[in-house]
């Protein structure tokens, strides 16, 4: 009797179990009672990444420099091209179809994690004892100056945006 289900890496067509095409190849002709499935390799700019019965290969992703993209990994007949962003930019989404500049951490915030080609800068509020007085994509919160180690006293308290101001100790006469 004709099969109703086929083995792994096969597909059912016209009551025949035909072999799927291997990754990197597309279907040219279904098998028959007398012939195997016929497959052809994808061209240089195309790929198929699974066992398949596709009659067309997929185009490799284009890393458009106008969108801030560059090639991270060149595609093969079995894999798509992987794009990443130019220096100072990161992907807008998981599919990385375009890039945006890294976010800067405002004064009062420091960089917790520096941005990569695929992730934005992560900022954190400067805790007590630390400050940041610049807007930066790479500077962490810095500790307040320790006046004591310089034999000075705090003349003006620090904030999350400003350092302490040290001054000479008042000498009792």
């Amino acid at each position: 009797e004709p099969p109703t289900a086929c083995r792994e890496k096969q597909y059912l067509i016209n009551s025949q179990c035909c072999s799927l095409c291997q990754p990197g190849q597309k279907l040219v002709s279904d098998c028959t009672e007398f012939t195997e499935t016929e497959c052809l390799p994808c061209s240089e700019s195309e790929f198929l990444d699974t066992w398949n019965r596709e009659t067309r290969c997929h185009q490799h992703k284009y890393c458009d420099p106008n969108l801030g993209l560059r090639v991270q990994q060149k595609g093969t007949s079995e894999t798509d091209t992987i794009c990443t962003c130019e220096e100072g930019l990161h992907c807008m989404s998981e599919s990385c179809e375009s890039c945006v500049p890294h976010r800067s951490c405002l004064p009062g915030f420091g960089v917790k994690q520096i941005a990569t080609g695929v992730s934005d800068t992560i900022c954190e509020p400067c805790p007590v004892g630390f400050f940041s007085n610049v807007s930066s994509a790479f500077e962490k919160c810095r500790p307040w100056t320790s006046c004591e180690t310089k034999d000075l006293v705090v003349q003006q308290a620090g904030t999350n945006k400003t350092d302490v101001v040290c001054g000479p100790q008042d000498r009792q006469r």
Epitope: V28, S29, C31, T32, E33, F34, T35, E36, E38
Partner: antibody, heavy 112, light 112 residues
């Protein structure tokens, strides 16, 4: 229903070229199957001569050397056989076949 | 070329009795994908060959279930479980794993 029908002269002179056509109905000749020519001399076993594929490429029996040509006319959904320099040993019933479906066969006699 | 040797050449059978035909190949008919393209045909007197079994053991549509095929590698068998009057004719095996495709010499089944 797939049907194949051979046509061509039943008598060919020695050294001439035998020409037969196979009209296919009920199925497009441009899809997956191979389209074969097979012959059967009187009271003898079947001999595969060659096939033409859906894409126009073909394969021939080496025993027929350079005498055989199989071509396809997709606009008429038919394929043809040419066998040159025939002799009496080429006398046979000639079948066109998809292998699961066959024509009824046509007897070609090579004689002067 | 692959040589297919059929036996017996002639097979007299009583109606309702089983029949068995052997086809031996000069080399393995299993291809690199694990498929074996060995087929069985029936040719009734004055008719074209008719496909019975493809890929060793698959009955073609419309073929009665008294016909079955088995075997692997180089050794294949066609069995008829209970012979009927309409089964009279010549039975051929055909391999399409290797080019050129080749037929067995045929087994003539007749009623005793």
């Amino acid at each position: 229903q797939v049907q194949l029908q051979e046509s061509g002269p039943g008598l060919v002179k020695p050294s001439d070229t035998l020409s037969l056509t196979c009209a296919v109905s009920g199925y497009s000749i441009t899809t997956n199957y191979y389209w074969n020519w097979i012959r059967q001399p009187p009271g003898n076993k079947l001999e595969w001569m060659g096939y033409i594929k859906y894409d126009g490429s073909n394969n021939y029996n080496p025993s027929l050397k350079n005498r055989i040509t199989i071509s396809v006319d997709t606009s008429k959904n038919q394929f043809s056989l040419k066998l040159s320099s025939v002799t009496a040993v080429d006398t046979a019933v000639y079948y066109c076949a998809r292998l699961d479906y066959w024509g009824q066969g046509t007897l070609v006699t090579v004689s002067s | 070329d692959v040589v297919l040797t059929q036996s017996p050449l002639s097979l007299p059978v009583t109606l309702g009795q089983p029949a068995s035909i052997s086809c031996r190949s000069s080399q393995s008919l299993e291809n690199s994908n694990g498929n074996t393209f060995l087929n069985w045909f029936q040719q009734r007197p004055g008719q074209s060959p008719r496909l019975l079994i493809y890929k060793v053991s698959n009955r073609f549509s419309g073929v009665p279930d008294r016909f079955s095929g088995s075997g692997s590698g180089t050794d294949f068998t066609l069995k008829i479980s209970r012979v009927e009057a309409e089964d009279v004719g010549v039975y051929f095996c055909l391999q399409v794993t290797h080019v050129p495709f080749t037929f067995g010499s045929g087994t003539k089944l007749e009623i005793k």
